[in-house]
């Protein structure tokens, strides 16, 4: 019979591979047919009979078509930090991604095997690059004419309003604070309302960096000791 | 990325053999099996077979069984297909393609080789 | 050898539109069909196999269905870059074959 038209198992024609989802067996030296994904080898074949295949048990999986003589366990259960995007099959395995809030620090072949929070910008910084599925926000110092009055891993600097009569200069954490546009006639001349209470600190003094504390999570990142990124909490 | 890049146009006599070259790079080449299709001028593609670089094996469709020979050369990561007696009616585009023998699909195509018959 | 016949050679349409290529083979394939996407001058392109599968890059406005003997490719909201020829192919049984392509024309 030409190939074409053989049952497995069949030995190749010199030089030939074998079909589409068969596979040689070095033992049997004949083409047979692989396993369907969701399914394994329960029995391999011989010169007379054909792989004999049977599904994979619960938490177990093949992805592939294949001639494994066991299913791959899958992983396991998703962690608090993380959501399960991909159930565990007899055909996938599970996948684990990162809630909002949290980037993937160690990724694996499909979804992540370890996550951290994103970083938190503090009052006088801003977000200079957003988080993403792997990667932390970078943050930056607010520039002059520029500020920041959140704690926050999304907000940016926002440039201070513009005043016609500055009460109180913007700095980088806090705006500018204009005064009234029609004074009240019980104020003197001239006078300026100011809200209470006033700072004092000059508009581009940043605030001094706090002690970050380590990630909420309970694994230790890979790095050796090193200072808290600027203008980061770790909240 | 992955590409298959193949060699230039070809015009050739009636009876003469062609053979096209198709260079593979940004993946494993001996993993993947390489297929040859072909387009004659105005119709639809047609299978011609399929090498397996890990050991050279092929799988010819019938029709070109006995005319054609693909080889591979494993150090260059490149795959040949030769057409021997070729007729007027070989004139079309020869394609290389990756292949994947479980689903039965090509995922990655070279850009193609023009093989013109003519006497 | 599997025949792999299109509906229509070619299909008019606007972009935005809805659009439905089909494709019939001549014997029981169970699920084993690929689509492609060929435009003059440029590499062939798959973008979808074992009849529902979306290739790595391609646009989920493609999508396939059917089963057995008829089978379906659909884009959704047909965009510019999709006028092109299209091929289905099955990937059940050796020699695999194609359809003979269904060319999208801007009506």
């Known amino acids: 019979l030409p190939a074409q038209v053989a049952f497995t198992p069949y030995a190749p024609e010199p030089g030939s591979t074998c079909r589409l989802r068969e596979y040689y067996d070095q033992t049997a030296q004949m083409c047979c047919s692989k396993c369907s994904p969701g399914q394994h080898a329960k029995v391999f074949c011989t010169k007379t009979s054909d792989t004999v295949c049977d599904s994979c048990e619960d938490s177990t999986y093949t992805q592939l078509w294949n001639w494994v003589p066991e299913c791959l366990s899958c992983g396991s259960r998703c962690s608090s930090d993380q959501v399960e995007t991909q159930a565990c099959t007899r055909e996938q395995n599970r996948i684990c991604t990162c809630r909002p809030g949290w980037y993937c620090a160690l990724s694996k072949q499909e979804g992540c095997r370890l996550c951290a929070p994103l970083r938190k910008c503090r009052p006088g910084f801003g977000v200079a690059r957003p988080g993403t599925e792997t990667s932390d926000v970078v943050c930056k110092p607010c520039a002059p004419g520029t500020f920041s009055n959140t704690t926050s891993s999304t907000d940016i600097c926002r440039p201070h309003q513009i005043c016609n009569v500055v009460a109180i200069p913007g700095n980088a954490s806090m705006d500018a604070v204009c005064t009234s546009t029609s004074p009240t006639r019980s104020m003197a001349p001239g006078a300026v309302h100011l809200p209470q209470p006033v700072s004092t600190r000059s508009q581009h003094t940043q605030p001094t960096p706090e002690p970050s504390t380590a990630p909420s999570t309970s694994f230790l990142l890979p790095m050796g000791p090193s200072p808290p990124a600027e203008g980061s909490t770790g909240d | 990325q992955v590409q298959l890049v193949q060699s230039g146009a070809e015009v050739k006599k009636p009876g003469a053999s062609v053979k096209v070259s198709c260079k593979a790079s940004g993946y494993t080449f001996i993993t993947y099996d390489i297929n040859w299709v072909r387009q004659a001028p105005g119709q639809g593609l047609e299978w011609i077979g399929w090498i397996y670089p890990r050991d050279g094996n092929t799988q010819y469709a019938q029709k070109f069984q006995g005319r054609v020979t693909m080889t591979t050369d494993t150090s260059t990561s490149t795959a040949y297909m030769e057409l021997r007696s070729l007729r007027s009616d070989d004139t079309a585009v020869y394609y290389c393609a990756r292949g994947d023998r479980d689903y039965g699909y090509f995922d990655v195509w070279g850009q193609g080789t023009t093989v013109t018959v003519s006497s | 050898d599997i025949q792999m016949t299109p509906s229509t050679s070619s299909l008019s349409a606007s972009v935005g539109d809805r659009v439905t290529i089909t494709c019939r083979a001549s014997q029981d394939i169970s699920n084993y069909l690929n689509w492609y996407q060929q435009k003059p001058g440029k590499a062939v392109k798959l973008l979808i196999y074992?009849?529902?599968k979306l290739h790595s890059g391609v646009p989920s406005r493609f999508s396939g269905s059917g089963s057995g003997t008829d089978f379906t490719l659909t884009i959704s909201s047909l965009q510019p870059e999709d006028f092109a020829t299209y091929y289905c192919q099955q990937g059940n049984t050796l020699p695999l074959t194609f359809g003979g392509g269904t060319k999208l024309e801007l009506k």
């Open positions: 074992f009849k529902s």
